[in-house]
Structure formats: C-alpha cells, structure tokens
C-alpha cells in the first residue's frame, strides 16, 4: 500500500526532512558544503548532488562564502543580504569561517603519514585525521590550505583528480571530494594460490555518504570555542578520539578482552565480543591478551594490513573471502564484487556496470561455488567478516541510488575499501 | 548486429570425428563466453561446455568430457568443437550460444541456427 | 545435479488468454533462472532471465517470478506467434540444467 507523503520523512545525520526539503549538507571537518544540495525524495531517501556551476563570463569571478558558485562582481547581491558568518578561536588564534588549518597533539593514535586538519565553520572548529599521499621527492613544500605537504609541481594538493568533484568551501577554500586511492600492484588470480600484495591500509568504516568525504579522514572531532578540550571518551583516566576502540580496564578485572568499547562522539559505547562456536579445529586453545580461543598450529597468512587468527578469524569474527573482477568495454566498465560464504556454501555477486560515471545497472546474484570456480578474472582482493559486508551493502544500496543520476567516479572503489580489515593493533581488537 | 553463423547440417560415420564451427560477427568475440549446446528429440537441451575467447579457457560438463574439445580461433572469430568417437548417441542439433557479458550465471542471449548432425 | 521439472508438458490456450508455466527446482537456486522460447525449426531465444528481467525487445506481456525452488513465467494475452516450446534453464549451479520443456499451442 502507498505510503501517505505526510508520514515519509527522510533522516539525515540524525535530522528529520520533510519530502521535498533541499539543504546543504553538514560534512566534517568541513562544515556546511554549499556545493552540495541535498533533497528528501518522496520514498524517504536522500539524494544529494554536487552543484554544478554555470560558466562566469568576466574576468575577475566573485567567491561569497555562503553560496557554491563564482559570480560576477555586477551579479553580486546587494551587501545588506550578505550572511555574517562566526569566526573560531582556538589556541589563541582567530579564524575566519571556512578557513583550514592545522592543529597538533588533539589525536593520540595519530600515525606518522597522518596530519590534523581543522576547519572554522559557523563559530565551530571541526577537525578530523587526514592520511596523506606518499610524496615522492626530496623537499616536500607546505600548502596554505592543507596540513600535508606536497611536492612542488603537483598542483595544490597532490591528490588525484577527478573533475567537477571539488567542493569549494566557503571564504574561497577547496577540499576535494575523494578518499586518496592508494595504488597498488593488483592482487594475484584466485588460481595462483598465494595471498601476497594487497591494497593498504583501509582506514574508513560504516557507509560512506555522511562525513567520510575528505582523503583519508579517518576520525572527526568537534571542538567547540568555550571548551577548548574535544569531543573525546575518557575512561580509566585515558582519553579516547571518536571511532577509536579499546578493551576496558577495570579495577577488579584488569583489562577486560571479552569486551569492546568505541567512543561515539563523548559517549563509550561497549559490547561484549562473541567468540564462534565452531572451530576449525579439535582443541581450541585460550590465550592470553584474546578473548575468543585459537587453533593452535601454523599462523594462517597474515595480508598485509589485516590480522587474523588461523583458519581466517578476525577479532573472533569469522572472514570470508572477497574477489573482484573489472571489465572495460565500449566506454562501459563492469564491476564485480563477489563474496564467499560457507553456510550456504555459495558467492554473491554484485555486478555494477557505469558508462561514463553513470550507473546503468546493479544487481546481485548468487550462485554456487562450483560455477564460480568456472568464471575467470575474479582476484582475491581480500577477507571480510558479515558485519562489514553488511555496512558495504548498506552503503552500496545509497550509492546506487546516488550514482544512478549522477556522475560518480570514485564512489565504488572507495565504497570497497569497507571490506579491508584494520590490522589489530598490539593484538588487541 | 549480432550475429553467430554454423553450418546447417553434418553427415558422418560411426566412429569418425568432426569439429562443428560458429563464426561470430556483430560484438568484440573475445569478450564474450562462447558456450556449445545440445538438443536432441525428445530429450531437452544439454550445455556441453564453455569457452573463454581471450584466452582459451575451457569449462565442460562432466558427461561431455571425453567427447568434446572445445577450440577458438581468435583471427576468425570462430569458434569449434570437435566431437570424437561418434555414435548414434551423438546425432543432435548442436548450438553454439553467448551469454550475457554482465551477469555471473550464464543467460544465453544469442544463439547460432545450429548444425544437425547425422551419425550414420 | 539441480533437476528442473517443468509443467505442464503442453498446453492449448486462445488468442487474449493468460498462460502461466511453472517450473520447481529440485534445490533453492536463488533467482538464477531463465526462459527461453523455441520455435518450430529455429534455435532458442532468450525471454527472461534472473527469474523476472525481461530480456531487450521481448514484448512485455512476458513476465516471470518466483523465488527459491519455485518459477513461473506468464503471458499476458497469448498471441499465435507465442506458439513455440518454453525451456527453463537454472543457471545457479554446474551442470546448467534444462527443464523438459513445454510445449504451447493455439486454440
């Protein structure tokens, strides 16, 4: 039965919109994008799109922070319309709005390719941790609107480009709209046997569409202008980032393995990590530091970047095997994305098929592992648990919806890189 | 437009051999698996096996195994097979088909006029 | 092997009338089903596949559903030119296998 308009709403970053309501969206660390209109579609989804600007004839074009596109000075509107917007103050300098910068010592667990970026947006400083590129010269130079260095020549930001998917932010400042693909040789064929180089370090969980949007932004942290500490977990007198995990310590207990804390935003959220019943094995063994038991004998072959117990247990969660297959002809690029699974024994195949950055098709088949092995061209790019499959198909299911109005160029891959599994760091998970 | 072209029919002994061909036109032939079917009266439609026409990759039902081989001759966009130690069983109608480029289970959409072939 | 047992074997229908043809799958082959029509002297021809995506340029009064071990395939308002043998094909599992098929006549 059709739903009655009245009751659809779409939700967005916790927001309810009306069907048909358009906003900007509010993507950290960047703050509200005004290159990007949003509107709630009569079945509840969001669709959001970039802005696409007209082409400016004059000279010397006008950026006004509130709106996406260039003007011309004569098309400008009248200066009592124009919308004042709050300046940030931390550590004792003043920002303007929409002014990047960077910040030192607000993430812990900051690697050593990684920055911190900050952005002022509407009296707020948002910051997040931006991976950056490998540079490949001697004398790197600083850039006024990144915290990574770059090496000369290479444009503003060395980042990959892909047109028309900048978002020009406000007081004329530009962060791209693409997570950094790191390129790697590709992965040896499902026949050969051997697991050896794998794409790095996949730092990006959950569904991509709300705040995942910078290259490399693993971690988002508000700072608001009266309490200059961020919006982090403490617990056990250690202090947290949001998206960060660690196994509690408890006075009585010590640490606490069985048990798995995240900060969301300021609040831990804890629970309790479930072991499989089954094993690969007779006699699984307990060891020290891990919740769940392990088969004793060989380590299983660690890809690079992921950590697993033997016979493919990943944090006690048992992984299955991704492979992927793409195909180019006539303009139109097929994509395959195939998972393993052992009850029911089968693969799921999720077929994509773009031309020109427009999805045409996507669907999903299953079929069982003795007709997959017939099918050439599928590498094993890597080993999953369900729980991140569910987050890729979640987010597969938006970017499907997105892409198929509008020119997605990287969205895919990148949606992809749900499915790599952190290594545990200090065998924790 | 896409087009898969065998020879009509086929009259050999028992015993004999022969390669059935299915020379492709209309789309990029090493594209697209090539697949070979049997029909016989009365006895419904019977996949013998696939092959990948960039690379000469095969795939055969277990029962068509020691009966046929499967060849492609990239040049002519043709593809064969060769059906050896005929006997009456044999004598079918035989089509080479495609199958659909963007889907994993194999959906034949165009099919060759076939060959009859006569053992006799 | 996956059995396919088609029904009916052959059936008479009038021109405007609705045919439907089923066919169980002796497994659950999720979806991975096709249709195909053979006429009187030609080859096959592909009509649905994925259990309900009408192939290009098959009119639309052909339609399929189903799901697990169950099929069908439905024409709207039969016509003399959808007089022909209906083949369905499970594509789930090697061996691919055929049902018998069925065979359509006009009324």
């Known amino acids: 039965e059709q739903v009655k308009h009245s009751e659809t709403y779409c939700m967005f970053q916790d927001k309810k919109y009306r069907v048909g309501e358009r906003w900007h969206p509010y993507l950290e660390p960047y703050g509200l994008v005004y290159c990007v209109n949003c509107i709630c579609s009569e079945n509840g989804n969001v669709l959001c799109s970039r802005v696409r600007c007209p082409n400016v004839h004059c000279l010397s074009p006008v950026h006004i922070p509130h709106l996406c596109c260039p003007r011309c000075p004569d098309s400008l509107p009248p200066v009592n319309n124009k919308v004042t917007s709050k300046s940030c103050e931390y550590n004792g300098t003043t920002y303007q709005h929409g002014e990047l910068f960077v910040a030192e010592g607000l993430f812990q667990n900051r690697q050593p390719n990684q920055c911190t970026q900050c952005s002022c947006s509407e009296g707020n400083v948002y910051c997040g941790l931006k991976t950056c590129p490998k540079l490949t010269c001697a004398f790197p130079v600083s850039v006024p609107d990144s915290c990574c260095r770059v090496c000369r020549g290479d444009g503003e930001l060395s980042w990959e480009h892909s047109d028309g998917d900048i978002f020009r932010q406000p007081a004329n400042r530009e962060a791209r709209h693409s997570y950094h693909r790191s390129h790697y040789d590709p992965p040896p064929s499902r026949q050969a046997g051997g697991l050896s180089r794998f794409p790095g370090a996949r730092s990006h969980r959950g569904a991509l569409m709300d705040s995942q949007q910078a290259s490399g932004t693993i971690v988002q942290i508000v700072i608001n202008n009266k309490h200059k500490h961020g919006q982090v977990c403490v617990s056990n007198g250690k202090t947290y980032s949001h998206g960060e995990s660690w196994h509690p310590n408890l006075r009585a207990f010590g640490i606490v393995e069985c048990v798995l804390c995240t900060c969301n935003v300021t609040k831990q959220e804890c629970k309790k990590i479930h072991c499989p019943n089954r094993y690969p094995c007779k006699y699984p063994q307990k060891i020290d530091g891990k919740c769940c038991k392990v088969c004793p004998g060989k380590k299983a072959k660690e890809l690079p970047g992921q950590s697993f117990d033997n016979k493919g247990y990943f944090c006690g969660e048992e992984t299955m095997p991704v492979y992927e297959s793409v195909f180019m002809e006539d303009g139109e690029t097929t994509r395959k994305i195939a998972l393993e699974t052992e009850r029911p024994p089968q693969v799921e195949v999720h077929v994509w098929t773009i031309r020109k950055g427009i999805l045409q098709h996507f669907h999903i088949e299953k079929i069982s592992k003795r007709m997959f092995e017939e099918l050439p061209h599928f590498k094993l790019v890597t080993r999953t648990t369900l729980s991140q499959w569910k987050i890729f198909t979640e987010g597969e299911a938006q970017i499907s919806q997105m892409c198929s109005s509008r020119v997605c160029r990287t969205e895919l891959e990148d949606l992809v890189k749900v499915l790599y599994l952190e290594r545990s760091e200090k065998g924790h998970c | 437009q896409v087009q898969l072209q065998q020879r009509g029919t086929e009259l050999v002994k028992p015993g004999a051999s022969v390669k059935l061909s299915c020379k492709a036109s209309g789309y990029t032939f090493t594209s697209y698996w090539m697949h070979w079917v049997k029909q016989r009266p009365g006895q419904g439609l019977e996949r013998i096996g696939n092959?990948?026409?960039?690379?000469?990759?095969?795939n055969y039902n277990e029962k068509f195994k020691s009966k046929a081989t499967l060849t492609v001759d990239k040049s002519s966009s043709t593809a064969y097979m060769q059906l050896s130690s005929l006997t009456s069983e044999d004598s079918a109608v035989y089509y080479c088909a495609r199958s659909k480029n963007n889907y994993v289970a194999y959906y034949f959409d165009y099919w060759g006029q076939g060959t009859t072939l006569t053992v006799s | 092997d996956i059995q396919m047992t088609q029904s009916p074997a052959s059936l008479a229908a009038s021109v405007g009338e609705t045919v439907t043809i089923t066919c169980r799958a002796s497994e659950n082959i999720y979806y991975s089903l096709a249709w195909y029509q053979q006429k009187q002297g030609k080859s096959p021809q592909l009509l649905i596949y994925?259990?309900?995506s009408l192939e290009d340029g098959v009119p639309s009064r052909f339609s399929g559903s189903g799901s697990g071990t169950q099929y069908s395939m439905k024409i709207n308002s039969m016509q003399p030119e959808d007089t022909a043998t209906y083949f369905c094909k499970q594509a789930y599992d090697v061996p691919l296998t055929f049902g018998a098929g069925t065979k359509l006549e006009l009324k």
């Open positions: 092959i990948n026409p960039s690379n000469g990759g095969t």
């Open positions: 994925n259990a309900n």
